[in-house]
């Protein structure tokens, strides 16, 4: 199975690392320091 982080969600996380949680079939973002929000777009 393809990792969506390498495809359609490649640019989903603005200031963070995209992580695909296989168990949940969901994408989440691990934000860089000082950033937060679903896409790590808030500071």
């Amino acid at each position: 199975k393809k990792n969506p982080c390498n495809a359609e969600f490649q640019n989903f996380c603005i200031h963070g690392e995209c992580k695909y949680i296989e168990h949940l079939e969901a994408v989440t973002c691990k934000c860089q320091q000082e950033y937060f929000g679903e896409r790590c777009g808030e500071k």
């Epitope: 963070g16 168990h23 949940l24 079939e25 989440t28 973002c29």
Partner: antibody, heavy 125, light 112 residues
Framework: EVQLVESGGGLVKPGGSLRLSCAAS????????MSWVRQAPGKGLEWVST????????YYPESVKGRFTISRDNAKNSLYLQMNSLRAEDTAVYYC??????????????????WGQGTLVTVSS | DIVLTQSPASLAVSPGQRATITCRAS??????????INWYQQKPGQPPKLLIY???NKDTGVPARFSGSGSGTDFTLTINPVEAEDTANYYC??????????FGQGTKLEIK
């Protein structure tokens, strides 16, 4: 109230097949990964299989890979385990278990937070 | 595969005393400061029950006398003080994202 009820266990001959079911209620079934865990008589716990929320990802230990197949029907709130080529060493109580989880700041932590009462599978000639 | 080794295999403790069960992993189960170890209690004839998740977090309704600690490869479940109803088997389990999701072999706790 979360409830998991297993069924389908019984006596089967070596080489035979059996299909276990787990009926879930009291929670949004489609939001949780699910697993089967077994326990041979007088022994410890052994993880048997896991399936992701939508069924796209399945996982097995080497001991059952190629013989067991996990599946789910989210419309019916049901989990299944198809067991083929059964062996004497597959004799055990089979539990279905829900994956509780925490998802925060990019971290995913999971655990078996609810278990059924189990169904006994006996493989014997 | 990660192997979990529990010790002791069994122990007998008097009511009011402390019971300590250890779980050693064959490799680290930590990631970015998070420890992926869970503890379960199983009483005879019953399914397992979650006690502790992520090494040190008590599940809802678990009495304060149960606590978990540790990191890396070494983890501990402590029951203090032990009560008669704590007679059970206890299992650790690793829940990294990589299968197999192994359990320890179990520890049997008997109350004297």
């Amino acid at each position: 109230e979360v409830q998991l009820v297993e069924s389908g266990g019984g006596l089967v001959k070596p080489g035979g097949s059996l299909r276990l079911s787990c009926a879930a209620s009291g929670f949004t079934f489609s939001s949780y990964a699910m697993s089967w865990v077994r326990q041979a008589p007088g022994k410890g716990l052994e993880w048997v299989s896991t399936i992701s929320t939508g069924g796209s990802h399945t996982y097995y230990p080497e001991s059952v890979k190629g013989r067991f197949t996990i599946s789910r029907d989210n419309a019916k709130n049901s989990l299944y385990l198809q067991m083929n080529s059964l062996r004497a060493e597959d004799t055990a109580v089979y539990y279905c278990a829900r994956h509780g989880y925490l998802l925060y700041e990019g971290y995913y932590e999971w655990y078996f937070d609810y278990w059924g009462q189990g169904t006994l599978v006996t493989v014997s000639s | 595969d990660i192997v979990l080794t529990q010790s002791p295999a069994s122990l007998a403790v008097s009511p009011g005393q402390r019971a300590t069960i250890t779980c050693r992993a064959s490799e680290s189960v930590d990631y970015d400061g998070h420890s992926f170890i869970n503890w379960y209690q199983q009483k005879p004839g019953q399914p397992p029950k979650l006690l502790i998740y992520a090494a040190s977090n008590k599940d809802t309704g678990v009495p304060a006398r149960f606590s978990g600690s540790g990191s890396g490869t070494d983890f501990t479940l402590t029951i203090n003080p032990v009560e008669a109803e704590d007679t059970a088997n206890y299992y650790c389990q690793q829940s990294t994202e990589d299968p197999p999701y192994t359990f320890g072999q179990g520890t049997k706790l008997e109350i004297k």
